[in-house]
Interface confidence: low
């Protein structure tokens, strides 16, 4: 009967509003990975953040945010035992809570930042479970009981292994894109210099070329100060 209730709960949650709380459960002492999917086009060029809700109606206190340079959002940034990384092409923000402890439990938000504003991508309830006695099936997932206020909570049993020190994940699509762009820019710069030398023309007068870097039409790669005029 309980697995049936869980299935109904999950089904109802998927049909309901965008900001229902998603429950992520992790085991004390282990790492927990929280994923926040989002529309990569809608949030193109925006940095992301992970914040902790202070009370039911209180402010959301920033824990960690992605790299200041949006193009480098794939780089994992740490604040204490919490890490954040963003696959901007795939549209997935991933937060890792290492060495989960009772004090990590609580209500959080994945946010998309624009200026001083922040859009909520997902509300997340992190729960810290005791060590499992054995490997349990989906029927054993916790769902809100009679004393809980998260009637529409969606449960994600995201218990992940501990990350090894210095472990480097496989590069997401965004890093591959960045490398490709840098490579293209270098080729274009070399071509420009070669053409200028060939035609006896000053490099500064070469007509600028649009650079799309392989993304969907209409979405230009932002020109960053560090990459300009290479």
């Amino acid at each position: 009967m309980e697995p049936l209730r869980l299935l109904i709960l999950l089904f109802v949650t998927e049909l309901s509003g965008a900001h229902n709380t998603t429950v992520f459960q992790g085991v004390a002492g282990q790492s927990l990975q929280v994923s926040c999917p989002y529309d990569s086009m809608k949030h193109w060029g925006r940095r992301k953040a992970w914040c902790r809700q202070l009370g039911e109606k209180g402010p959301c206190q920033r824990v960690v945010s992605t790299h200041n340079l949006w193009l480098l959002s794939f780089l994992r940034r740490w604040n204490g035992s919490t890490a954040i990384t963003d696959d901007t092409l795939g549209g997935t923000l991933t937060i890792t809570l290492r060495n989960l402890q009772p004090h990590d439990a609580g209500l959080y938000q994945c946010q998309s930042l624009h200026g001083s504003e922040a859009d909520t991508l997902r509300k997340v309830l992190v729960e810290v479970l005791a060590d499992p006695l054995d490997h349990r099936d989906a029927g054993d997932l916790w769902f809100p009981g009679e004393s809980e206020s998260f009637e529409d909570a969606h449960v994600e049993h995201s218990i992940s292994r501990s990350l090894l020190e210095g472990e480097i994940p496989f590069p997401p699509t965004s890093i591959l894109l960045l490398l490709a762009c840098i490579f293209l820019i270098k080729i274009l710069a070399a071509s420009a210099l070669w053409a200028a030398a060939w035609h006896g023309q000053k490099p500064g007068t070469h007509p600028p070329s649009e650079l799309d870097c392989g993304h969907d039409p209409g979405y230009q790669l932002q020109t960053l100060p560090g990459l300009r005029d290479t």
Epitope: A28, G29, Q101, P102, A105, L107, L129, D131, W142, S147
Partner: antibody, heavy 126, light 107 residues
Framework: QVQLVQSGAEVKKPGASVKVSCKAS????????ISWVRQAPGQGLEWMGW????????NYAQKLQGRVTMTTDTSTSTAYMELRSLRSDDTAVYYC???????????????????WGQGTLVTVSS | EIVLTQSPATLSLSPGERATLSCRAS??????LAWYQQKPGQAPRLLIY???KRATGIPARFSGSGSGTDFTLTISSLEPEDFAVYYC?????????FGGGTKVEIK
């Protein structure tokens, strides 16, 4: 009202095992965990571990790992704590307490121990 | 593990006086700290949780304060039934630990 009633005093020989029970009433048993705390004569309180009555998950204090087993019987709303290979320094009053809730959530209120059982004196003596 | 040090070990006061009990953590526990009262031959009773929130049925003369590593339990005016041993407990990190206790005795 919420109540935890523990089993009676026990006298055991070194090397033996003891199993203390804790019967809960007045609340939905599976919505909470049961924690176990012991207190040696004239000493302070020592946390032994906790079990989720919802799914049987446990966390034990490292120093007792391998000697202690906590279980629950949801049909009778009873929690059990078994301690094996008893030594004289295991002589203590053993308390059960309600809490935390079945999973840690929110701020400290989720993990408070309230209420407590009346305690079970376990004497280990040859 | 987090070590909680309570001071003083014994506090000798008269009824009506103010009692101030201290609990210091070996590392920050934020506000994840509770206080319990224990009378001889009885089980502990929850007084304060989240460092400063009074548990149900606890009189207003009991108050808790502090965060991080330093915490205080204050009994504004001691009643005869308040003479007991008081323990602090951190619920921030496993293993959950208790302080050594402060005995409040009649002067």
């Amino acid at each position: 009202q919420v109540q935890l009633v523990q089993s009676g005093a026990e006298v055991k020989k070194p090397g033996a095992s003891v199993k203390v029970s804790c019967k809960a009433s007045g609340y939905t048993f599976t919505n909470y965990g049961i924690s176990w705390v012991r207190q040696a004569p004239g000493q302070g309180l020592e946390w032994m571990g906790w079990i989720s009555a919802y799914n049987g998950n446990t966390n034990y204090a490292q120093k007792l790992q391998g000697r202690v087993t906590m279980t629950t019987d949801t049909s009778t709303s009873t929690a059990y704590m078994e301690l094996r290979s008893l030594r004289s320094d295991d002589t203590a009053v053993y308390y059960c307490a309600r809490g935390p809730t079945k999973a840690y959530y929110g701020s400290g209120s989720y993990v408070v121990f309230d209420p407590w059982g009346q305690g079970t004196l376990v004497t280990v003596s040859s | 593990e987090i070590v909680l040090t309570q001071s003083p070990a014994t506090l000798s006061l008269s009824p009506g006086e103010r009692a101030t009990l201290s609990c210091r953590a070996s590392q920050s526990v934020s506000s994840y700290l509770a206080w319990y009262q224990q009378k001889p031959g009885q089980a502990p009773r929850l007084l304060i949780y989240d460092a400063s929130k009074r548990a149900t049925g606890i009189p207003a003369r009991f108050s808790g304060s502090g965060s991080g590593t330093d915490f205080t339990l204050t009994i504004s005016s001691l009643e005869p039934e308040d003479f007991a041993v008081y323990y602090c407990q951190q619920v921030s990190l496993f293993p959950l630990t208790f302080g050594g206790g402060t005995k409040v005795e009649i002067k």
